[in-house]
Interface confidence: low
């Protein structure tokens, strides 16, 4: 189920799958929610630790049992991923942090009159992931009102420093507030060039596009279909970026599909989950559990309810069925995508709906004049 | 909202506008989305207008002037007014609206978390009231959704300011001693939300007050935590399955 409580002065021991710098526990929790393996997190505010390297440290954690031992650590904040929390799942983070400088690659500097204007510029710049703004009272006069637009390899700051009269925050593109707009078109038989930032296996171009949308550095993608000439590259989804923000070239190529991230769409973003079920397809991955269920939809529901399950295969082979129930293979991988995709099998595959935000699995724990 | 500022897209995605279409169409009240098919509002919004088919509910909007004849809206399937609400009194000013069709959630249209039943221990220090209501006592409905940060006031303090009225434990008050910031006409039924541990919760429903933003006259809100049993009973019995889950 959905667990939203935060544990003050507590730190989860072990289970680390990733670490990064985040300005507060809520942003750390959001990164945990969107990380394919993270179930738990621990965050170290600046006040909680003397070690400068660990200040603002966000530690993403996994556990086979779904829990980890808690140790007392003054100032630390720990909690759960919101993976099964329905409408609370959002990559949108509006907060502005005063007295904090989020470090990264500074690729644009301009003078603006307010931190809100700086955030707006970041939101309207295709490459900007986060920003810092030096206020009018910043100690060095020449830097006052400077708005620094930034990015980093992982989408989170490479460091966070306490610095007076500086305010920082994140792009509001995940809030569907970008003024850039987006290309919804999918280009058949076209391959984009430029830098590959990641490679995953997906059953179709639409899953590839959604993964691109929620990847911090993906601006466009190319997907190689299951009939692509090179067998080892079939179902490969290449997530790409470029200096300009658009592909520098594209090549006509049979059995490829290309398109753009939808992060810059106005007013609506795709859900960070994939609900389609793929008949005749087997998703390979690490086995989490095998259970007998009645029908592929129940198999998907079972995967969704088991928080560590990322995708599933429902087998219809006679040897995998007992009466009306057949085997439901619950699986996971390091990156949340299948490690192999096989066609022509007797069965169906699909993804967990744990990141869908439309479900009702959204527990929110924890005479005069009328108007 | 008196003394407020413009909200931005998606800042308060649970806020809805309750509008009445008779000869013309106008905004009358606010409301809060609490489930795919449920809106929580004030009972007094329906005083004299209990007919379901005259109401139009707009969700996922920021600017009322953007509404055209083509703007999608929800219609009411059922209005559930609290059984103890009386038009002549300010008590039990709470109502549920069941929508004809469930709404999909987006960044601009999603529900607000409800508080725990009888939540009295949480100290809320970051509370906001939102709405399209008047920006002064003899004002007009605002186009852009307004927001204002207002501190909660103890019921004892609130009772001192309203000697002629009974401030019950099922009400919550908010305001500044000096006035200047408050909800006003047209904000009724809308949310008083407070952020605690990174999560927004619906603490109050805008209900009544002496004028708007007057000195030492806080706004009075229906305390949602006191009505959790009623909300859960109505939303669950309506169609046999829980529409929202109460806090654990």
């Amino acid at each position: 189920g959905c667990l939203t409580q935060l544990y003050e002065n507590a730190f989860f021991r072990g289970g680390d799958v990733a670490s990064m710098y985040t300005p507060n526990a809520q942003y750390c929790q959001m990164r945990c929610t969107f990380h394919p393996r993270c179930l738990l997190f621990s965050f170290l505010p600046a006040s909680s630790i003397n070690d400068m390297e660990k200040r603002f440290g966000c530690f993403l954690k996994d556990s086979v049992t779904g829990t980890l031992p808690k140790v007392h650590r003054t100032g630390a904040v720990s909690g759960h991923s919101l993976k099964q929390c329905g409408h609370q799942i959002s990559a949108c983070h509006r907060d502005i942090y005063k007295g904090v400088d989020m470090r990264g690659v500074n690729f644009n500097v301009s003078k603006v009159s307010s931190v809100e204007e700086c955030q707006k510029r970041c939101t309207s710049n295709i490459r900007c992931q986060f920003f810092s703004y030096a206020t009018q009272t910043f100690h060095k006069a020449e830097y006052r009102n400077n708005c620094l637009l930034k990015y980093s390899p992982g989408g989170t700051p490479t460091a966070i420093k306490v610095l007076s009269n500086v305010e920082s925050g994140f792009s509001l593109k995940p809030c569907a507030l970008s003024e850039i707009g987006c290309h919804m078109n999918i280009f058949q038989h076209l391959a984009f060039s430029d830098v590959d930032v990641a490679r995953v296996l997906t059953p179709d171009a639409f899953v590839c596009r959604t993964i691109c949308t929620y990847h911090p550095n993906c601006l466009f993608f190319t997907f190689y279909t299951n009939v692509w000439k090179i067998e080892s590259q079939r179902n490969v989804c290449l997530l790409k970026t470029s200096e300009s923000g658009t592909p520098s070239s594209s090549t006509p190529q049979e059995n490829t599909i290309s398109g753009y991230s939808l992060l810059t769409c106005k007013r609506t973003l795709p859900e960070p989950c994939h609900s389609k079920i793929y008949p005749g397809v087997d998703f390979g991955g690490e086995e989490l559990n095998v259970t007998f269920v009645k029908g592929v939809n129940v198999c998907q529901e079972t995967c969704t309810k088991m928080i560590r399950c990322q995708f599933f295969t429902y087998s219809l082979l006679p040897e995998d069925c007992k009466e009306e129930k057949c085997k439901c293979f619950l699986r996971l991988s390091m990156d949340g995508s299948p490690t192999r995709i096989a066609y022509g099998t007797q069965g169906s595959s699909g993804y967990s709906l744990r990141l869908c935000n439309t479900g009702d699995n959204s527990v929110c724990t924890t005479k005069t004049s009328t108007r | 909202i008196v003394g407020g500022t413009n909200s931005s897209w998606g800042e308060w995605p649970w806020q809805v506008s309750l509008q009445v279409k008779l000869t013309a169409q106008r905004h009358l009240c606010g409301g809060s989305l609490i489930g795919h098919q449920w809106v929580l509002t004030a009972a007094h919004c329906f005083d004299g207008l209990p007919l379901q088919d005259v109401w139009r509910i707009y969700s996922g909007i920021l600017n009322l002037s953007d509404i055209t004849k083509d703007t999608p809206f929800s219609q009411i399937k059922e209005i559930i007014i609290h059984q103890n609400y009386k038009v002549s009194e300010g008590n039990h000013d709470i109502a549920l609206i069941k929508l004809q069709a469930p709404l999909n959630y987006t960044e601009f249209q999603k529900p607000i978390c409800l508080p725990s039943k009888g939540d009295t221990s949480t100290i809320y220090t970051n509370c906001w009231v939102t709405g399209w209501g008047f920006s002064k006592e003899k004002g007009e409905i605002q186009n852009i959704l307004q927001k204002v940060n207002i501190p909660l006031v103890t019921n004892e303090e609130c009772q001192k300011r309203y000697q002629d009225y009974k401030i019950t434990q099922r009400m919550v008050c908010a305001g500044y001693k000096e006035g200047g910031k408050d909800a006003c006409k047209g904000d009724s039924g809308g949310p008083l939300v407070c952020k605690h541990n990174g999560m927004w919760r619906l603490v109050g429903i805008t209900s009544w007050g002496e004028g708007c933003a007057r000195r030492e006259q806080p706004g009075v809100y229906t305390k949602v935590a006191e009505y959790m049993d009623w909300i859960l009973e109505k939303t669950q019995s309506s169609d046999g399955k829980a529409q929202m889950q109460s806090p654990a």
Epitope: - | N63, G180, K181
Partner: antibody, heavy 122, light 106 residues
Framework: EVQLLESGGGLVQPGGSLRLSCAAS????????MMWVRQAPGKGLEWVSG????????VYADSVKGRFTISRDNSKNTLYLQMNSLRAEDTAVYYC???????????????WGQGTMVTVSS | DIQMTQSPSTLSASVGDRVTITCRAS??????LAWYQQKPGKAPNLLIY???TLESGVPSRFSGSGSGTEFTLTISSLQPDDFATYYC????????FGQGTKVEIK
């Protein structure tokens, strides 16, 4: 530093048109109600028009209603006053102004531009 | 429309004098009244808002009082820099200025 800089004034014949601009800097222009106020030579101050932060709500003094149009471009931090069907009695220094707190009721004007002179004469 | 009437139109006074200017509204404006000082060729300068709240940076010799329809601006001890024209302004319903009071050297 907070600044308002009016421009666009000049000599125009009765019945003519002028467009005044007010360039704002040093504050978040888009958050505030903006005003035009005028002062005829040797006379008192007269409020002309106001525009709310989004530009969605505009208000006018009776003396200019139907002839003047106030507008704003929040992306350019600029306030405008389009003046049509000008009359001799519109001759004045035109100031743009705003109230720093931004709250709708606390809108005495505490920041003013230096003014631009409009002369309507044949 | 709300009309604002100031009196007197002109006031002659000496340095050190206590000076009082009154402003009357044609209908109640609660406390939504401001006072401005203007010197020749310059833009007005806000002194007081909400009838009695001193704008930051304004000397404490300036004070405002009143509510409803009757308002007063008082300069407790007139200084050489205070010779100017003073305007009241209501902002209860839109914005209206009084016709001004010129404070000149006696």
């Amino acid at each position: 530093e907070v600044q308002l800089l009016e421009s666009g004034g000049g000599l125009v014949q009765p019945g003519g048109s002028l467009r005044l601009s007010c360039a704002a800097s040093g504050f978040t222009f888009s958050h505030y109600i903006m005003m035009w106020v005028r002062q005829a030579p040797g006379k008192g101050l007269e409020w002309v028009s106001g525009i709310y932060s989004s530009g969605g709500i505009t208000v006018y003094a009776d003396s200019v209603k139907g002839r003047f149009t106030i507008s704003r471009d929040n992306s350019k931090n600029t306030l405008y006053l389009q003046m049509n069907s000008l009359r001799a009695e519109d001759t004045a220094v035109y100031y743009c102004a705003y109230r720093r707190t931004g709250a709708p009721r606390r809108d005495a004007f505490d920041i003013w531009g230096q003014g631009t002179m409009v002369t309507v004469s044949s | 429309d709300i009309q604002m009437t100031q009196s007197p139109s002109t006031l002659s006074a000496s340095v050190g004098d206590r000076v009082t200017i009154t402003c009357r509204a044609s209908q109640s404006i609660s406390s939504w009244l401001a006072w401005y000082q203007q010197k020749p060729g310059k833009a007005p300068n806000l002194l007081i808002y909400k009838a009695s709240t001193l704008e930051s940076g304004v000397p404490s010799r300036f004070s405002g009082s009143g509510s409803g329809t009757e308002f007063t601006l008082t300069i407790s001890s007139l200084q050489p820099d205070d010779f100017a024209t003073y305007y009241c302004q209501q902002y209860n319903t839109y914005w209206t200025f009084g016709q001004g009071t010129k404070v000149e050297i006696k």
